[in-house]
């Protein structure tokens, strides 16, 4: 395969540039991201000395993707700066393959193997230098660049320490064989951020898991701050194309955030799918089920294609605080299927949350424990109390008449009423479990337009002598 690719390298022409000369390695010294023109090339040791390449330090290779502009975009500048700030002694190399990336998408895709081989050859050459170790190499590829990194890891003699795929490109890579895309076999640790996956239309980012751990912020699709509402206001972007760019590029900014906001690390939680995560089922850190994201992701044994999820803010710092809420709804009447809208406000030692809606993913289970996911942008500190509100919903005259008749026959219980004795909460970030109880055990009922207050009554979830209230069904 290598010989074949070598031949391709020698003969392939892309516009005015021969493919062999179409990849440049732009070594960025810490003299500032504006410094230009320190290029590395295989067999030429002088630039390594001139630009003070540190053989024993970590080495990052940043690999861009397809481009329509023919220039290296600002995300790259931000990523270089962030890496240099976080890892002051590290070598940062930008892989410039603009001649092959500034083409039709299909042509750029067909060039990814050649570019990957070129990166591998650079790494092979560097391995011959005293002190240089492949284990210290971290390839960071965005979009098509993620697959380039995969090919580089596949072709290099030995094993690269880490590859980070930042929203690896989807078209022409989705569902293909592991040797034709980024895969866990390409490095000792492959971590991936998926931010633009779509199950309908074209998915710019790959949907399938392709690393050891695959992190899907906000389910991997609709990123906060990138919606049409946000962009039409022209706060950050102005067109549909810019919405796409915003969501696709969010992976890069999450990675940058993990470098610069060390004190505000985001955590992702293992889950089988986005829906289960939205239900709040997956906030466990047991058995390596949670991990840092971006630069802070850690290799865990025996994980492969592990899907992980988290919620984020709309901008840096992206960190939010996740809470699992377990609520048992007791129903004293067979009210049929109800679709209530619940809101909670969390009160902590540091702050109180905004009014948070409880997302009902499927349907409320009556006389059953329901699990919800809520998240706050601010650190509330230790939770003290919770206000639960059932939003009054507009109903037909017939519904109101039925309720009025029901009230006449049984004045003490409106038909649309539920009873909640306690709320159990688990913090994703601290893994702490708390139980919140109603103040008066006799006043546990809630109806549309009403609110219930719950106060911290226990650390942990297990209650002594728990007994279920008698359920009256009529």
């Amino acid at each position: 395969a290598e010989e074949q690719l070598e031949g391709g390298l020698r003969t392939a022409k892309d516009g005015p540039a021969a493919a062999k000369a179409a990849v440049r390695f732009h070594f960025r010294t810490s003299k500032g991201p504006e410094r230009e023109g320190c290029y590395l090339s295989v067999g030429h040791s002088q630039p390594l000395e001139d630009c003070s390449f540190n053989m024993t330090a970590k080495t990052f290779f940043i690999i861009h993707g397809w481009t329509m502009s023919g220039m290296l975009e600002n995300w790259l500048h931000k990523l270089v700066s962030a890496l240099q700030m976080r890892e002051k002694d590290a070598n940062v190399v930008v892989v410039d393959w603009l001649p092959l990336a500034h083409q039709l998408y299909t042509d750029a895709v067909n060039s990814t193997r050649v570019v990957g081989l070129s990166v591998a050859k650079m790494l092979d050459w560097l391995q011959g230098k005293d002190g240089f170790s492949l284990g210290n190499v971290h390839l960071i590829g965005y979009s098509l660049g993620a697959h380039v990194a995969g090919f580089a890891g596949n072709f290099v003699k030995g094993t690269v320490g880490r590859i980070t795929g930042l929203d690896p490109a989807g078209p022409m890579f989705e569902g293909v064989d592991i040797h034709r895309r980024l895969s866990p076999d390409d490095a000792d640790f492959v971590d991936v951020l998926h931010t633009y996956t779509r199950s309908f239309g074209i998915s710019i980012g790959i949907q399938m898991p392709v690393g050891h751990i695959d992190i899907y912020p906000n389910g991997g699709d609709f990123q906060p701050g990138c919606g049409l509402n946000d962009v039409l206001g022209s706060i950050a972007y102005g067109t549909i194309a810019e919405v796409v760019k915003c969501e696709h590029e969010r992976a890069v900014h999450l990675f940058v955030d993990s470098l610069v906001n060390q004190d505000k690390p985001s955590f992702a939680f293992q889950c089988t799918d986005s829906n289960r995560f939205k239900k709040g089922i997956c906030l466990s850190c047991r058995k390596n089920r949670c991990n840092g994201i971006g630069y802070n992701a850690k290799k865990t044994r025996n994980k492969r294609n592990t899907k992980m999820y988290l919620k984020t803010r709309a901008g840096m710092p992206f960190r939010v605080y996740h809470y699992q809420m377990k609520i048992h709804f007791f129903s004293y009447k067979s009210v049929g299927a109800i679709e209530p809208t619940f809101y909670v406000t969390l009160y902590g030692t540091n702050a109180e949350s905004q009014v948070l809606s409880l997302e009902i993913v499927e349907q409320i289970g009556l006389n059953a424990t329901n699990t919800f996911l809520v998240y706050t942008e601010e650190d509330l500190g230790d939770l003290l109390k919770i206000k639960l509100t059932w939003e009054g919903t507009s109903r037909s005259w017939y519904d109101l008449w039925r309720e009025f008749r029901s009230y006449l026959s049984q004045p003490h219980r409106p038909e649309r009423e539920l009873s909640i004795r306690r709320i159990r909460v688990k913090s994703g970030e601290t893994q702490r479990r708390l139980t919140f109880c109603v103040e008066d055990p006799e006043k546990t009922s809630i109806a549309p337009g009403q609110e219930l207050w719950f106060y911290k009554c226990r650390d942990g979830w297990r209650m002594k002598n728990e007994t279920s209230p008698t359920v009256e069904l009529s």
Epitope: D14, G15, P16, A17, A22, R24, H26, P33, E34, E36, G37, Y39, S69, G70, M71, L72, E73, N74, L76, H77, D96, L98, P99, H102, S234, I235, A236, Y237, G238
Partner: antibody, heavy 120, light 107 residues
Framework: EVQLQQSGPELLKPGASVKISCKAS????????IHWVKQSHGKSLEWIGH????????NNNEKFKDKATLTVDKSSSTAYMELRSLTSEDSAIYYC?????????????WGQGTTLTVSS | DIQMTQTTSSLSASLGDRVTISCRAS??????LNWYQQKPDGTVKLLIS???KLHSGVPSRFSGSGSGTDYSLTISNLEREDFATYFC?????????FGSGTNLEIK
């Protein structure tokens, strides 16, 4: 010392075409991109487009898509901009400017400008 | 396209004065803001890149600041050679766009 030397002033008739040159010296020509900027009389600056001399890739402002064609000759470290179907609206000073390969790089060195006058 | 607005088209000042020229972007440009000086003979020079980074050879009396959509160029202790036109330019999004310019003249 980085220098961008542009060709001299041009006086042309409507409908004609013109090719303005920008010769670079004092740095490695392929390490930076060359951009072209228009300044109409007494007005602001407008970005026309750029060329990456390393491989000849170009990108134009939509407004100038059908007006300007950018090329380079690597052997002489010279960038060219051809303007076609000239009208009086094209009368302006045209600058070439050097920029790194990053969006974020500024236009760090400029040519002295080429004055184009289109008149019948 | 991102609109760059320099509200003050002309500014009069005396030698030794301190002047501030402002520039506003129609949307957040993430500090990708550059300042240029154009002399009456048409010569254009880079002064400041990335909001506040002084280009080599530019006197330290020039400084830049700002964030989001609002940026400014300050010249302290004006000298004779500083009387010129100043343009801001955003490097955040294609097409790159410039402000309309502020002409600084001697009072």
């Amino acid at each position: 010392e980085v220098q961008l030397q542009q060709s001299g002033p041009e006086l042309l008739k409507p409908g004609a075409s013109v090719k303005i040159s920008c010769k670079a010296s004092g740095y490695t020509f392929t390490d930076n991109t060359i951009h072209w900027v228009k300044q109409s009389h007494g007005k602001s600056l407008e970005w026309i487009g750029h060329i990456n001399p390393y491989y000849g890739g170009t990108n134009n402002n939509e407004k100038f898509k059908d007006k300007a064609t950018l090329t380079v000759d690597k052997s002489s470290s010279t960038a060219y901009m051809e303007l076609r179907s000239l009208t009086s609206e094209d009368s302006a000073i045209y600058y070439c400017a050097r920029k790194g390969i990053y969006y974020s790089s500024p236009f760090d060195y400029w040519g002295q400008g080429t004055t184009l006058t289109v008149s019948s | 396209d991102i609109q760059m607005t320099q509200t003050t088209s002309s500014l009069s000042a005396s030698l030794g004065d301190r002047v501030t020229i402002s520039c506003r972007a129609s949307q957040d440009i993430n500090n990708y803001l550059n300042w240029y000086q154009q002399k009456p003979d048409g010569t254009v020079k880079l002064l400041i890149s990335y909001t506040s980074k002084l280009h080599s050879g530019v006197p330290s009396r020039f400084s830049g600041s700002g964030s989001g959509t609002d940026y400014s160029l300050t010249i302290s202790n004006l000298e004779r050679e500083d009387f010129a036109t100043y343009f801001c330019q955003q490097g955040n999004t294609l097409p790159f766009t410039f402000g309309s310019g502020t002409n600084l003249e001697i009072k």
